[in-house]
């Protein structure tokens, strides 16, 4: 199809190196083209921003995305040729950073309905640029965390090393949908809630002489709780001796509740005393059985081959730890009788 | 059932003082941030102030900075908007708004709820 009639919008992502970041762009159709087949977010015209992300509806929830080759080869389509790129209905997302993601971007609706369609499309200029060493040093991360039932805010990471008093207007989405516009680098949560993580992206426009960009940077939030103030308490086992058949294979399962730390460094191990010997026993990896917002339970075996006599004198020792402090439960194998 | 009253409109001389209230009649309208608007004769919807119910944050216009407080009373769920050193371009229709999403934020069409309005007039 022909390109020349799609309106035409300049981005620039300026990434960190230092960090893993994500990018997205929104199939932000032109009106008229897009009113009747967008809905409008419950806002009506007179106070609809000229240009919102494409929402899709139920008759259109789809777009196509192709990749206009610099060296004038025909339009790609993007699902075919780069893995690291996904689309999610309306949205494209860069799941990599990278200087290569440069390049022109189309979208179009999937379905041609009225003969305003034919022109209905995007064409989105990517720029995509390392962040150079002169940037700000204490930028804002591209991963930020909100502590549930407190007041919390995300910062605009290509804006985090500007006062308010310098911010441009910013306009915030929050999972594809227009959020608000701020002059202030920065929303704040009065009080935060599971429903306030998500995939946020700021926006705001620069200008040269030549032209103006949008400088988009996308921030993954996440709800989390405080950080535990307890020790890790151990489930299994909860008896300090085992009923075991002698000569046959044992295994000793050791399952423990940790609290959510931010830094999260989990010790769960066995070890082995005998009279005044003590080790620690190789045994397999560790695993997550269970993981809410609030804690994890890891479990960890010891597997003996086949008990013997000498493993009834010894005390079988399940040692778990956080940053807080250590906890252990031992376990003395006794012979089953009859 | 309108969930937001606005009260406490009305003539004023310039340099007077006029005190707004706004009372929520459910819980969850007032949810998140609190925020006064107005609107002149001709003019489209502005910001005025806003407040965050927890966290008691507040945002305010420049044009209002310094003259107006705007505060709340959670016990109430009602919030007012203090004017002090009131001018003639303060003339407007002010509305109260309650956004559930929890941001605070100053975009008029981010908030969920609206009142009615009430009128503020001040004369030269």
């Known amino acids: 199809f022909n390109i020349s009639g799609c309106s035409t919008k300049k981005l620039l992502w300026t990434y960190s190196t230092r960090s893993e970041e994500e990018f997205v762009l929104f199939c932000d159709l032109p009106e008229p083209q897009k009113s009747h087949f967008c809905h409008r977010n419950r806002l009506s015209p007179k106070q609809v921003p000229e240009h919102l992300p494409f929402m899709g509806s139920n008759d259109l929830s789809d777009v196509q995305w192709y990749q206009q080759p610099s060296n004038g080869d025909p339009l790609e389509d993007i699902r075919k040729s780069y893995p690291h790129i996904i689309q999610d209905k309306c949205t494209l997302h860069f799941l990599t950073p990278g200087v290569n993601n440069s390049g022109s971007y189309i979208c179009r609706p999937k379905m041609i309905k009225s003969p305003y369609d034919v022109a209905c499309c995007v064409k989105m200029i990517l720029e995509v640029k390392p962040q150079t060493n002169a940037s700000c040093e204490y930028s804002a991360s591209h991963k930020q965390d909100l502590l549930l039932g407190s007041t919390g805010s995300i910062s605009c990471p290509s804006l985090s090393c500007q006062s308010d008093a310098q911010s441009p207007a910013v306009t915030w989405y929050k999972n594809g949908k227009l959020l608000s516009v701020e002059r202030s680098n920065r929303i704040v949560v009065d009080e935060v809630y599971d429903y306030h993580q998500g995939t946020y992206v700021c926006d705001y426009t620069q200008s040269d002489t030549v032209s103006s960009w949008t400088v988009r940077a996308v921030v993954q939030v996440r709800t989390i709780v405080g950080d535990t103030k307890l020790k890790p308490d151990i489930l299994d086992p909860v008896e300090d001796t085992l009923e075991v058949e002698l000569g046959k294979p044992l295994t000793i399962s050791c399952k423990a509740r940790f609290g959510f730390e931010r830094v999260f460094n989990p010790v769960i191990k066995w070890y082995i005393k005998d009279s005044d010997l003590e080790w620690e026993v190789s045994v397999p990896e560790a695993k997550s059985i269970k993981s809410t917002l609030k804690d994890e339970i890891i479990e960890r075996n010891i597997i003996l081959e086949k008990v013997t006599q000498r493993d009834l004198r010894r005390k079988f020792v399940c040692f778990v730890q956080n940053s807080i402090g250590n906890t252990t439960q031992s376990v003395q194998l006794k012979e089953k009788r009859g | 059932d309108v969930p937001l009253q606005e009260s406490g409109g009305g003539l004023v001389q310039a340099g007077g003082s006029l005190r707004l209230s706004c009372a929520a009649s459910?819980?969850?309208?007032?949810?998140?941030?609190m925020g006064w608007f107005r609107q002149a004769p001709g003019k489209e919807r502005e910001f005025v102030a806003t407040?965050?119910?927890?966290?008691?944050?507040?945002y305010y216009a420049d044009s209002v900075k310094g003259r107006f407080t705007i505060s709340r009373d959670n016990a109430k769920n009602t919030w007012y908007l203090q004017m002090n050193s009131l001018r003639p371009e303060d003339t407007a229709v002010y509305y109260c708004?309650?956004?559930?999403?929890?941001?605070?934020?100053?975009?008029?069409?981010?908030?969920?709820?609206w009142g009615q309005g009430t009128q503020v007039t001040v004369s030269s």
């Open positions: 459910d819980r969850t309208v007032s949810k998140g941030a």
């Open positions: 708004a309650a956004d559930s999403s929890g941001i605070i934020r100053t975009t008029s069409w981010a908030y969920d709820y």
């Open positions: 407040i965050g119910r927890s966290s008691g944050i507040t």
